[in-house]
C-alpha cells in the first residue's frame, strides 16, 4: 500500500532571464527513494539516481543544474519554459509517486517572488 505523499511548490512564477528551483518532497512513507526523474511535459530534464548521481539530459545541460537536494534549478528562463513540470519518485517497495509543478515565466517584473524555493 502506498502511503506517501508528495509536497511541491505548486504553481510558481518567475521572470524571464531569471532562475527558479523546482522542489518536491516525499513524506509519510519509509520507502527508499531509488531514483527521481524530472520531466517537462513529455521531455526528460534530469535524473537523480541513488547510486549513479545526477544525469542532466544533453539538450538541457546549459540551463539546468542539479539540486539543491533532489530539486532542480532552471536557469536563463524563457517564456517557452512556461508549463507543467513533474517530479517522479521511484521508490522501493512502494512504487512510483508523482508531483506536479506549474511554472509561469513572465516577461516583466510582474512575477511573484513569494515562492519559498525561488532564487532572488
Amino acid at each position: 500500500m502506498m502511503t506517501g505523499t508528495i509536497e511541491t511548490t505548486g504553481n510558481i512564477s518567475a521572470e524571464k532571464g531569471g532562475s527558479i528551483i523546482l522542489q518536491c518532497h516525499l513524506s509519510s512513507t519509509t520507502a527508499q527513494v531509488t531514483q527521481v526523474n524530472w520531466e517537462q511535459q513529455d521531455q526528460l530534464l534530469a535524473i537523480c539516481n541513488a547510486d549513479l548521481g545526477w544525469h542532466i539530459s544533453p539538450s538541457f545541460k546549459d540551463r539546468v543544474a542539479p539540486g539543491p537536494g533532489l530539486g532542480l534549478t532552471l536557469q536563463s528562463l524563457t517564456v517557452n519554459d512556461t508549463g507543467e513540470y513533474f517530479c517522479i519518485y521511484h521508490t522501493y517497495p512502494d512504487g512510483t509517486y508523482t508531483g506536479r509543478i506549474f511554472l509561469e515565466v513572465l516577461e516583466s517584473s510582474v512575477a511573484e517572488h513569494g515562492a519559498r524555493f525561488q532564487i532572488p
Partner: antibody, heavy 117, light 107 residues
Amino acid sequence: EVQLLESGGGLVQPGGSLRLSCAASGFTFNAYPMTWVRQAPGKGLEWVSAITGSGGSTYYADSVKGRFTISRDNSKNTLYLQMNSLRAEDTAVYYCARVWRNHLDYWGQGTLVTVSS
Amino acid sequence: DIQMTQSPSSLSASVGDRVTITCSGDKLGHTYTSWYQQKPGKAPKLLIYRASTLASGVPSRFSGSGSGTDFTLTISSLQPEDFATYYCQQGYTLPWTFGQGTKVEIK
C-alpha cells in the same frame, strides 16, 4: 567475496571493434549498477560508461558516445562493453567496477586494449 | 562537467610523515567525493567515500574531510605500503570525473 574479472582485450586496428566482458561473482549482480573506467598508459583514470542494475538506463562519456555500448546479462552475471570505430586514443587498460552510492567499491584487475596499425 | 583539480601532482615523503592531498571541484556543493589508491600494475582500490567514510578494511591512518568544493585526504603516518598514486573522484553528477592523481614517492 566480491570478484570482477575482465576479458576480451587485445590488439585491434583503428576503426576495428572489440567486446570486453566482466564476469562478476560474490554479490547479487542485478542489485548494483556497474561501470567501466579506463586508464591510458601512464595517465590518470577516465570514466567511460555506466549502467543501472536492471540495464534499463545507460550513460556514456562524450568521448565514446555513439561508438561504445554498455550492456549486461543479469542471468550470466556479466557486464559488457562493445567498442566500435576504435581510435588510437582508446588505447588503455579498461576496468569494470561495481557502483554503490556514487562510488566504485570493487574493481576488476583490468584488460588492456591496444589500438594500433 | 565538473572538473576535479588535485594537488600536488606528486610529493616525496618519509615513513612516518603526515601527508595531505587536496582536491577541489567547481560546482560541487556536496559530499559525493571518493578517494582511491592505485599501485603500479594494479587496479584502483577504494579508500574513502562520501568525503569522510572509511571503506571496509582500510587502515585508520587514512582519513577524509571536506564538503562543498574542497576535499582532503590525509595519511596520518605514512607506511611503506602507502607509496602509490591517489585519485579523487566526484560521484555527484555524470560524467563522473577524477582528479589527475597524486603520486606519493619515497624521499
